[in-house]
Amino acid sequence: GILNLNKMVKQVTGKMPILSYWPYGCHCGLGGRGQPKDATDWCCQTHDCCYDHLKTQGCSIYKDYYRYNFSQGNIHCSDKGSWCEQQLCACDKEVAFCLKRNLDTYQKRLRFYWRPHCRGQTPGC
């Protein structure tokens, strides 16, 4: 669920998601449209696709709560719980490390970016 994602992103990136990423650019945070603004925004667009796929698989992406371990900078999604819980953890792990990989190109001006400015083709999944 969303609590898992927030905690994981904070642990991996060191940033407070609600201040740094939700929202950011055209795809970080709820919803998403248009061309991603930078590499960080692409992370979120890919994550949206990951969630969309799980939704088509009948998973409750905002409700399902999963277990994971964070140690020495790495995330280990446990092999406990349902298929949906495990896959949800994998989606969130991927976005967390994607955001971390792109910290060096993070742009403060894209925080709280005005969504009507998000133009162009929304990338397909």
Epitope: Q57, G58, C59, R67, S78, D79, K80, G81, W83, E85
Partner: antibody, heavy 119, light 106 residues
């Protein structure tokens, strides 16, 4: 060789607490990914999953019965326990324990123990 | 929770006949698992991850399906196949079973 065996009181009165024990051999509940579930089956009816405990003491419960269930384990004695509070006649069933390891199903089952709740 | 509906509830088949038991999920699941149970015995693991036969299961059994529709098939019914078959999912919590299909020998 993996074996599981359930034991229980056999008969108990309505409103009492049911205590069940699953004794197993052939595997260790300290192994990563390992877990044991309790599943019940009223006579002539289908299977109902009740609760699951993992190697690291993480516990999962069936939401419809969660308030009445407590699962626990004694890793050193190779035992898993289930308590069901405030039983009534609807809890009359054969209770099974079953092993789940890193997949989404039960590859090993106990023989079951019949529990009868009298009014 | 995901509800698994098995059909038919009861059926009978003659030796040599092809048998298909269906399991319909209330929403899409990734895998289906099947158990066989005979009177007075505990359930036996039968088919895992939709189509893989558990150890010792005869090759006349097969499993298939995707999404919300799954099935267990016996290519040629034998007397020892008379039993109740249950489907099970753990795609999402809680883990659930179907109500069972009782297969009788005609």
């Amino acid at each position: 060789q993996v074996t599981l065996k359930e034991s229980g009181p056999g008969i108990l009165q309505s409103s009492q607490t049911l205590s069940l024990t699953c004794s197993f051999s052939g595997f260790s509940l300290s192994t990563s990914g390992m877990g044991v579930s309790w599943i019940r089956q009223p006579s002539g009816k289908g299977l109902e999953w009740l609760a699951h405990i993992y190697w690291d003491d993480d516990k999962r419960y069936n939401p419809s019965l969660k308030s009445r269930l407590t699962i626990s384990k004694d890793t050193s004695r190779n035992q898993v326990f289930l308590k069901i509070t405030s039983v009534d006649t609807a809890d009359t069933a054969t209770y099974y324990c079953a092993r789940k390891h890193s997949d989404y199903w039960f590859a090993y089952w106990g023989q079951g123990t019949l529990v009868t709740v009298s009014a | 929770q995901i509800v698994l509906t098995q059909s038919p509830a009861i059926m009978s088949a003659s030796p040599g006949e092809k048998v298909t038991i269906s399991c319909s999920a209330s929403s899409s699941v990734s895998y289906m698992y099947w158990y066989q149970q005979k009177p007075g015995s505990s359930p036996k693991p039968w088919i895992y991850r939709t189509s893989n036969l558990a150890s010792g299961v005869p090759a006349r059994f097969s499993g298939s399906g995707s999404g919300t529709s799954y099935s267990l098939t016996i290519s040629s019914m034998e007397a020892e196949d008379a039993a109740t078959y249950y489907c099970q999912q753990y795609h999402s919590s809680p883990l659930t079973f179907g109500a069972g299909t009782k297969l009788e020998l005609k």
